[in-house]
Interface confidence: low
């Protein structure tokens, strides 16, 4: 069979080989398409509702005024010339529709290095057959599910027109120290060959590199955190990051109802002040970061000095003091 591709909505003429150029003709067309149950026979006489879909022209060719999805299938013509010689024509018809230019919607203006980010959603509407969407970085194809690239695809079919809408959501994890202004684009490749790809306008998000917070240091005075009753303990939370983050304090894993401050002073220590203290630094562009925990305890005069040990609990680096 000879392969024929026709655009949806366009007219199509199929020649009946060997047929006399004008009547009288001995020929018949047989169709097996989405419009037929098994084979439908059409003759030059025509007539009836099929004339609006397909009719035999005076020269024996079959004319379809506006090809639709239901016209995909096999078309056969059997003709006999004036000398009684029989000729058969056999066509396999496939239809296509080129969608509008794809678009990137929900596009991100900024990506964060080192974490997964949604770049955007590529949308193509009105294709047949469905075709495919693919993403490009700086003009080169991106391979999904490889090196921090993932793609979520969705295909929907319009209930009335039968045309396809494709959606493709791109997630990437930009490498630290990589290109600060990558260029992404998306292209639609038709399901039938010989039709060129349609490409979106490119997008150029910025890549933001978060500066990792250095470790939050908790300094205790007196060193070791053991103090005589009535003494004073000073806890200082040191964070090298700029601008200075907000510092909150925790005791035994519970936030203390105090205004943010890098210094916590415990004057005139009593039994109620004993416990495990830590500070939490919250930077505007990072999550909270907790220091190691230190244990504040009261020692009676004449007791041994503090010794380092460890206590379980929060899983943080913990310094327990006797």
């Amino acid at each position: 069979a000879q392969n024929i591709t026709a655009r949806i909505g366009e007219p199509l003429v199929l020649k009946c080989k060997g047929a006399p150029k004008k009547p009288p003709q001995r020929l018949e067309w047989k169709l097996n398409t989405g419009r037929t149950e098994a084979w439908k026979v059409l003759s030059p006489q025509g007539g009836g509702p099929w004339d609006s879909v397909a009719r035999v022209l005076p020269n024996g060719s079959l004319f379809l005024p506006a090809v639709g999805i239901q016209d995909e299938g096999i078309f056969r013509c059997q003709a006999m010339n004036r000398n009684g010689k029989e000729t058969k024509s056999n066509y396999r018809v496939r239809v296509y529709q080129i969608p509008g230019k794809p678009e990137i919607v929900d596009s991100a203006s900024e990506l964060t290095a080192g974490v997964p980010n949604k770049v955007g959603t590529c949308v193509s509407e009105g294709s047949y057959p469905a075709g495919t969407l693919s993403w490009h970085l700086d003009g080169k194809p991106l391979v999904p599910n490889e090196k921090g690239v993932s793609v979520k695809e969705q295909t929907r079919r319009h209930p009335e027109t039968g045309l396809f809408t494709l959606q493709s959501e791109l997630m990437v994890t930009p490498a630290r120290g990589g290109d600060p202004r990558p260029t992404f684009s998306c292209s639609f490749s038709p399901g039938l060959p010989r039709h060129r790809a349609l490409r979106t306008a490119p997008i150029q998000p910025r890549v933001w590199e978060p500066v990792p917070l250095e470790e939050v240091q908790l300094v205790v005075e007196p060193e070791g955190g053991a103090v005589a009753p009535g003494g004073t303990v000073t806890l200082t939370c040191e964070v090298p990051a700029q601008p200075s983050p907000q510092i909150h304090w925790m005791k035994d894993g519970v936030p203390l109802p105090l205004p943010p401050s890098p210094v916590l002073i415990l004057p005139e220590i009593g039994p109620q002040d004993q416990g495990t203290y830590s500070c939490v630094a919250t930077h505007s562009s990072h999550g909270p970061q907790e220091s190691r925990a230190v244990s504040i305890s009261i020692i009676e005069p004449g007791e041994e000095g503090p010794t380092a040990g460890s206590v379980g609990g929060s899983g943080l680096g913990t310094l327990a003091l006797a």
Epitope: Q97, I98, P99, G100, K101, E125, G126, S127, R156, H158, P159, T161, L163, T165
Partner: nanobody, 117 residues
Framework: QVQLVQSGGGLVQPGGSLRLSCAVS????????MGWYRQAPGKQRELAAR???????NYLDSVKGRFTISRDNAKNTVYLQMNSLKLEDTAVYYC???????????WGKGTQVTVSS
């Protein structure tokens, strides 16, 4: 000839609301994808919201939850309801119609939205 007639722009304070309308002449509306685009001074035009003929919608990340696009096929009109407006929403807003698989493409003349205190 398809025509797009826009209305509803204006001056509004931050946090306020506006509703843009785009009325389309011609029978092509029901099978068209409609979009609202915006262009701020010195910036590229960007797609703020779109609605397909089947009713599926997409939004620019920065307007999600604040803007709602809808269509009334009986009135051949598409709407953009803009709530909790911010200073950065100031732009000229354009209505766009795409139909017949992108072969038909029309733009409205644009309407100014200014968010200012």
């Amino acid at each position: 000839q398809v025509q797009l007639v826009q209305s509803g722009g204006g001056l509004v304070q931050p946090g306020g609301s506006l509703r843009l309308s785009c009325a389309v002449s011609g029978s092509i509306f029901s099978s068209a994808t409609m979009g609202w685009y915006r262009q701020a001074p010195g910036k590229q035009r960007e797609l703020a919201a779109r609605i397909s003929s089947g009713g599926s919608t997409n939004y620019l990340d920065s307007v999600k939850g604040r803007f709602t696009i809808s269509r009334d096929n009986a009135k051949n009109t598409v709407y953009l309801q803009m709530n909790s407006l911010k200073l950065e929403d100031t732009a000229v807003y354009y209505c766009r119609l795409q139909a017949n698989f992108g072969l038909v493409d029309y733009w409205g003349k644009g309407t100014q939205v200014t968010v200012s205190s």
